[in-house]
């Protein structure tokens, strides 16, 4: 027997239902009460999902798991796991048995968007050219860790002076906090990029500091 | 008929070194995962360590990894066990058994057994 | 890991007792859970497997039910050769842990 699976990993979003594909060929004749089919997790070797004896015996993962039944005979012993949740992130190996054997092993990604980043300014009043500024970029619940990038109003990258931190709460999503530190010019708008590199999503936010008006201080 | 027949126990001292060899028939052995199951004087059972069919995954209980290797040949249809450092507590039958299926792990219980070899690590 | 814990630890029962041995788990192991037979001097002898399944050549007074957490090996009518120690084994997970043993012993 030849088990198959998909080459790419399978991305699945947080608290979405995933399918990781698995088909085998049976031969004509060929009956469920042959059929071993188990799915462990790669590296551990625990135990997720299992089909044996002529009979599916359930989940043995968290019992978000589950085969479709109806499909088993045609040669599909692909797993649907539901809710998915960032630790279920990771290899997953399906292995059926019919007279001989073979398994394939299927990566699944996990991915969470990022929110629209809200930005934050320190000093918020009383804004001088030439005064240095904290311009904070916060953006949550999501998952990889993100990506950020700072320019200014030109489009012109801004490198120096970012700090970005990057925290996973209980759910293992990440708030990302990116600080920019800026002397200000006569006006400026500043955009904050946070990129989640798997879903390739992008989100935005800026701030323009437009001065009351800005103007720069009279020479002695 | 399934048979299992470990051989290379005996005694040694600690911090000696051993090789159990379990020879297997009556089954297509490079079809099943194998594994080593002990036990000490009067005690209960304890996985030691499993092996896949094609040796590509190998697992160890806690208390003798890094001092235990388990290979297998299939051309042989023999298992082994390299037992390294051994300690007082390592005294036990040493169980070669048949894993049901190819791989080893979640759902891959063991079917048949061998008769065991006794190890003995004493000074 | 998962610990795996049988009661009682000994009986003592007459042939053609009714006999029950339970074992519990500290999580889940589905249904991948396994009772072995050891007599004095010799190897585990495999009777259940996938919780209910009867192993080829054990007689059918054996059988065993439960889910989860919990499970009972029970041998209907006993025989003057099923006086021996018995385990519980899960395989749901390495590393494979067993029940600490029954010891079913003659009244």
């Known amino acids: 027997v030849e088990v198959q699976v998909s080459e790419d990993p399978v991305v699945a979003l947080v608290d979405t239902d995933a399918t990781l594909r698995c088909s085998f060929s049976p031969e004509p004749g060929f009956s469920l009460a042959q059929l071993n089919l188990i799915w462990q997790l790669t590296d551990t070797k625990q135990l997720v999902h299992s089909f044996t004896e002529g009979r599916d015996q359930g989940s043995a993962y968290s019992n978000r798991t589950a085969l479709f039944p109806d499909l088993l005979v045609q040669g599909n012993a692909s797993l649907r796991l539901q809710r998915v949740r960032v630790t279920d992130e990771g290899s997953y190996t399906c292995f059926v048995s019919i007279q001989d054997f073979d398994s394939a092993a299927v990566s699944l990604q996990v991915a969470a968007p990022y929110s629209k980043p809200s930005m934050t300014l320190e000093p918020n009043k009383d804004l001088r050219p030439g005064n240095m500024v904290t311009i904070t970029c916060s953006s949550y619940q999501g998952y990889p860790e993100a990506e950020v990038f700072w320019k200014d109003g030109q489009g012109v990258p801004l490198t120096g002076n970012v700090t970005t931190s990057q925290m996973a709460n209980e759910r293992g999503l990440f708030d990302v906090h990116s600080v920019l530190r800026v002397v200000l010019g006569a006006n400026g708008t500043y955009s904050c990029l946070v990129r989640n590199p798997v879903l390739q999503q992008d989100a935005h936010g800026s701030v323009t500091i437009t001065g009351q008006p800005l103007t720069f201080p009279p020479e002695a | 008929e399934v048979q299992l027949v470990e051989s290379g126990g005996g005694l040694v001292q600690p911090g000696g070194s051993l090789r159990l060899s379990c020879a297997a028939s009556?089954?297509?052995?490079?079809?099943?995962?194998m594994g080593w199951v002990r036990q000490a004087p009067g005690k209960g059972l304890e996985w030691v360590s499993s092996i896949s069919w094609d040796s590509s995954s190998k697992e160890y209980a806690d208390s003798v990894k890094g001092r235990f290797t388990i290979s297998r040949d299939n051309s042989k249809n023999t298992l082994y066990l390299q037992m390294n450092s051994l300690r007082a507590e390592d005294t036990a039958v040493y169980y070669c058994?048949?894993?049901?299926?190819?791989?080893?792990?979640?759902?891959?219980?063991?079917?048949?057994w061998g008769q065991g070899t006794l190890v003995t690590v004493s000074s | 890991d998962i610990q795996m814990t049988q009661s009682p630890s000994s009986l003592s029962a007459s042939v053609g007792d009714r006999v029950t041995i339970t074992c519990r788990a500290s999580?889940?192991?589905?249904?991948?859970l396994a009772w072995y037979q050891q007599k004095p001097g010799k190897a585990p002898k495999l009777l259940i497997y996938l919780t209910s399944s009867l192993q080829s050549g054990v007689p059918s007074r054996f059988s065993g039910s439960g889910s989860g957490t919990d499970f009972t090996l029970t041998i209907s009518s006993l025989q003057p050769e099923d006086f021996a120690t018995y385990y519980c084994?899960?395989?749901?997970?390495?590393?494979?842990?067993f029940g600490q043993g029954t010891k079913v012993e003659i009244k």
């Open positions: 084994m899960q395989s749901k997970s390495l590393p494979f842990t």
């Open positions: 999580q889940s192991v589905s249904s991948h």
């Open positions: 009556g089954f297509t052995f490079s079809d099943y995962g």
């Open positions: 058994a048949r894993a049901w299926i190819a791989i080893i792990g979640g759902g891959a219980h063991f079917d048949y």
